[in-house]
């Protein structure tokens, strides 16, 4: 609808009208998967009662989810930017593979377990213009992967919601430990 | 199924402000992203800038940041677009698109788009 | 920006044959494997409407006639065959960079 000259709207405007930044741009993509992944774990905790289950660790073996260790240079003792941002960029480019599997584990949440696979791609994206090292990164082999996401497909239903819990869990895990050494960049 | 619902047009007078809305269903309005694009026979298409819902951030064209202001209201689903001190260059049809990559995004769905005309 | 200029403008192509419209990138749109180049079809009085994302990956419910090629900075997408609703624009986006840019368009008549 029109607005009369020098009339405000009532809505009150984002603050930021700046394009954003890199590191805004990185910190909202995150935040934007963190909340994706949250839908789809309350998908699968309402469906499973893998959320509760202690039998995890049946599962954790086939598995080989990356994790943030204190070697990788993203904790605050032992920060080294450059050493964490080649992990953050190496971690998720093993995530992909997972959340590849997520893809048809979803009934209800089908299209947000795609947005949170395309958003991830996004951000890695965003990351590769961050970092300095890129010959550091190791990409995945894609036969190792396609043999990988045969074997998770392969599983009995238990293990393959087990699975869908795990990566979910490992996944938010990561992208928090992420944000956090992201933002003392 | 996903839609977005887009008044189809505006008559708006030179130096006025219009706001524009886009009312969504078929989906879970506030885990998604709109984005706003202007098309032109002149100039094409053209990304504005994005809004999240979930909590109000937004993300905006250098060539548009002075321009437009992008709002969402989470109770009846709906994202807005303010265009302020408006011009003849400002006639185009505007789009909404939900992005599902995030704030940087390629759009399966889309509005009909808004077609402003700014005149006297 | 990134600029990115479609070839040609505007072609005709007769039914059952096929179409192949080009789109080049003033700079590279990969990153690890994945080109962020999309690919649009609009007809007059509607939005565009989403054919192909990364490049090559085709969209849900869009016939296999439209494919997408390319890596980096030169990218194709082609009809084979060409059907008469296939009479349209076709434009080309890339999101590898803020501000998202599009193609200029290449409008396929039939002849």
């Known amino acids: 609808a029109p607005v009369p000259p020098g009339e405000d709207s009532k809505d009150v405007a984002a603050p930021h009208r700046q394009p954003l930044t890199s590191s805004e741009r990185i910190d909202k993509q995150i935040r934007y998967i963190l909340d994706g992944i949250s839908a789809l774990r309350k998908e699968t905790c309402n469906k499973s009662n893998m959320c509760e289950s202690s039998k995890e660790a049946l599962a954790e073996n086939n598995l080989n989810l990356p994790k943030m260790a204190e070697k990788d240079g993203c904790f605050q003792s032992g920060f080294n930017e450059e050493t964490c941002l080649v992990k953050i960029i190496t971690g998720l480019l093993e995530f992909e593979v997972y959340l590849e599997y997520l893809q048809n584990r979803f009934e209800s949440s089908e299209e947000q377990a795609r947005a949170v696979q395309m958003s991830t791609k996004v951000l890695i994206q965003f990351l590769q213009k961050k970092a300095k090292n890129l010959d550091a990164i190791t990409t995945p082999d894609p036969t190792t992967n396609a043999s990988l996401l045969t074997k998770l497909q392969a599983q009995n239903q238990w293990l393959q919601d087990m699975t869908t819990h795990l990566i979910l869990r490992s996944f938010k895990e990561f992208l928090q430990s992420s944000l956090r050494a992201l933002r003392q960049m | 199924q996903v839609q977005l619902q887009q008044p189809g047009a505006e008559l708006v007078k030179p130096g006025a402000s219009v706001k524009m809305s886009c009312k969504a269903s078929?989906?879970?309005?506030?885990?998604?992203?709109i984005h706003w694009i202007k098309q032109t026979p002149g100039q094409g298409l053209e990304w504005i800038g994005a809004i999240y819902p979930g909590n109000g951030d937004t993300s905006y064209s250098q060539k548009f940041k002075d321009k437009a202001t992008l709002t969402a209201d989470r109770s009846s689903s709906t994202a807005y677009m303010q265009l302020s001190s408006l011009t003849s260059e400002d006639s185009a049809v505007y789009y909404c698109?939900?992005?599902?990559?995030?704030?940087?995004?390629?759009?399966?769905?889309w509005g009909q788009g808004t077609l402003v005309t700014v005149s006297a | 920006n990134i600029v990115l200029t479609q070839s040609p403008a505007s072609l005709a192509v007769s039914l059952g044959q096929r179409a192949t419209i080009s789109c080049s990138a003033s700079e590279s749109v990969d990153s690890y494997g994945n080109n962020f180049m999309h690919w649009y079809q609009q007809r007059p009085g509607q939005p565009p409407k989403l054919l192909i994302y990364l490049a090559s990956k085709l969209e849900s419910g869009v016939p296999a006639r439209f494919s997408g090629s390319g890596s980096r900075t030169e990218f194709t997408l082609t009809i084979d065959p060409v059907e008469a609703e296939d009479a349209a624009t076709y434009y080309c986006?890339?999101?590898?960079?803020?501000?998202?840019?599009f193609g200029a368009g290449t409008k396929l008549e039939l002849k």
């Open positions: 078929g989906y879970t309005f506030t885990n998604y992203i």
């Open positions: 986006q890339q999101n590898n960079e803020d501000p998202l840019t």
């Open positions: 698109a939900r992005g599902d990559a995030g704030y940087s995004a390629w759009f399966a769905y």
